[in-house]
Interface confidence: medium
């Protein structure tokens, strides 16, 4: 295996809590830049399984404004454009790691924080029950 | 917007670095036990558009190992069970906040980083270009 | 490959501890986290507790709360599981298991145990 | 604690046959149920993750179903190599518990 010294610069933690309690540089480093910046934008409306996107804002989170998928059928869009109820519409859930402000209404503590949220919808094929 | 009061039991960080530099705690409060538990984790199969699961691996990075949805075909799955080209099977893409270790190798020291993964597929119309 | 090797057999008196150790090879420490788990004779699987590689951050099962420790040496690869207070109820085989820090269809996944170590046979006998 | 309950507690069955094994946990724990065989003298090995997510290098006889509360282990067609005990195994809340286990023999 990869064998790591550990780092000398490292700060040293005198925290009662360490190592539950450390220090976080929030200056966000964006990975994405050399992604392809043509994004799932319009996928929510092209998609056979379209969504509407809800905003869910909370001041005392980071990010504070999150979007989330809604699907808009129970079923999906067939070649026709109507809705076909042998298939099912279905969020596409993802958790996400945010910080909450703690104790409250601190600028400088806080907690790490799992939420799950929906990002999109896809077209499944039902699970069907049969009834002996 | 609304003016939140800063609440007078936040510790006080001397660092010279902040704001951007905070406490946070890593003990993950889970905010996910109220929501149905029913994961979407068998829809990468089920899904018009299936997916396959890759791993992209990291050691500086949480969570170090991130399982990355792509598309099994570029078409999507019809009735019939065979891939229809007349539609597409598109990445459902997300930003994520991840933590690295900053500097390197320190275990209680950490910038917020954020990057983009694709959690999974749905099937969308194409979008068609007509030459003149 | 991925591998986990422990510390050999130890034949202990009550009231004395034991520290068994695991030294993983074949995949980046930081990348997931070392679970303990042990097997009374005949008896099924107890996790007692783990740490979480990148953070440092250890949680242990009640029932060894107090009396159990685990520590992990990034720079060795090894990871620790140190039981104090030992009577015969403690005589087991003690596994190590790796746990992956993954983020899996989705989740923030809490984890299996993806590969294990091959078991140090504790005794405690006066 | 999350109490999971195996069962059967034994089961002596012939090569080739179909082998079941269920698991049921004291309360919702989604997907986050996973299995693991152990033979005698060895240390556990994982079979499937996250409820029916197969391991490379596991025999495609091995699968996995269930969500929720209750969970199943099966084994298409067994074979003589695949005795042992199998155990399932909760993450979906600290501590991690285990099943009481089920041991598989051949006729």
């Known amino acids: 295996g990869i064998t790591i010294p550990r780092n000398p610069g490292c700060p040293n933690s005198e925290d009662k809590n360490f190592p539950r309690t450390v220090m976080v540089n929030l200056n966000i480093h964006n990975r994405n830049t050399n992604t392809n910046p043509k994004r799932s934008s319009d996928y929510y409306n092209r998609s056979t399984s379209p969504w509407n996107l809800h905003r869910n804002e909370d001041p005392e989170r980071y990010p504070s404004v999150i979007w989330e998928a809604k699907c808009r059928h129970l079923g999906c869009i067939n070649a026709d454009g109507n809705v076909d109820y042998h298939m099912n519409s279905v969020p596409i859930q993802q958790e996400i790691l945010v910080l909450r402000r703690e104790p409250p209404h601190c600028p400088n503590s806080f907690r790490l924080e799992k939420i799950l949220v929906s990002v999109g919808c896809t077209c499944v094929t039902p699970i069907v029950h049969h009834v002996a | 917007g609304i003016t939140i009061p800063r609440n007078p039991g936040c510790p006080n960080s001397e660092d010279k670095n902040f704001p951007r530099t905070v406490m946070v705690n890593l003990n993950i409060h889970n905010r996910n036990t109220n929501t149905n538990p029913k994961r979407s984790s068998d829809y990468y199969n089920r899904s018009t558009s299936p997916w396959n699961l890759h791993r992209n691996e990291d050691p500086e990075r949480y969570p170090s190992v991130i399982w990355e949805a792509k598309c099994r075909h570029l078409g999507c799955i019809n009735a019939d069970g065979n891939v229809d080209y007349h539609m597409n099977s598109v990445p459902i893409q997300q930003e994520i906040l991840v933590l690295r270790r900053e500097p390197p190798h320190c275990p209680n020291s950490f910038r917020l980083e954020k990057i983009l993964v694709s959690v999974g597929c749905t099937c969308v119309t194409p979008i068609v270009h007509h030459v003149a | 490959e991925v591998q986990l090797v422990q510390s050999g057999a130890e034949v202990k008196k009550p009231g004395e501890s034991v520290k068994i150790s695991c030294k993983a090879s074949?995949?980046?420490?930081?990348?997931?986290?070392i679970s303990w788990v042990r097997q009374a004779p005949g008896q099924g699987l107890e996790w007692m507790g783990g740490?979480?590689?990148?953070?440092?951050?250890?949680d242990y099962a009640q029932k060894f709360q107090g009396r159990v420790t685990i520590t992990a040496d990034e720079s060795t690869t090894t990871a620790y599981m140190e039981l104090s207070g030992l009577t015969s109820d403690d005589t087991a085989v003690y596994y190590c298991?790796?746990?992956?820090?993954?983020?899996?269809?989705?989740?923030?996944?809490?984890?299996?145990?993806?590969?294990w170590g091959q078991g140090t046979t504790v005794t405690v006998s006066s | 604690e999350i109490v999971l309950t195996q069962s059967p507690d034994f089961q002596s069955v012939t090569p080739k046959e179909k082998v079941t094994i269920t698991c049921r946990a004291s309360?919702?724990?989604?997907?986050?149920l996973h299995w693991y065989q152990q033979k005698p003298d060895q240390s556990p090995k994982l079979l499937i993750k996250?409820?029916?997510h197969s391991i490379s290098g596991v025999p495609s006889r091995f699968s996995g179903s269930g969500s929720g509360t209750d969970f199943t282990l099966t084994i298409n067609g067994l074979e003589a190599e695949d005795a042992g005990t199998y155990y399932c195994?909760?993450?979906?809340?600290?501590?991690?518990?285990f099943g009481r286990g089920t041991k598989v023999d051949i006729k």
């Open positions: 740490i979480t590689n990148f953070f440092g951050i250890r």
């Open positions: 309360q919702d724990i989604g997907y986050e």
């Open positions: 996250y409820a029916s």
């Open positions: 074949g995949g980046s420490f930081p990348s997931y986290g």
């Open positions: 195994h909760q993450s979906s809340e600290l501590p991690h518990t």
């Open positions: 298991a790796r746990e992956p820090n993954e983020f899996w269809n989705g989740y923030y996944a809490t984890h299996d145990f993806d590969y």
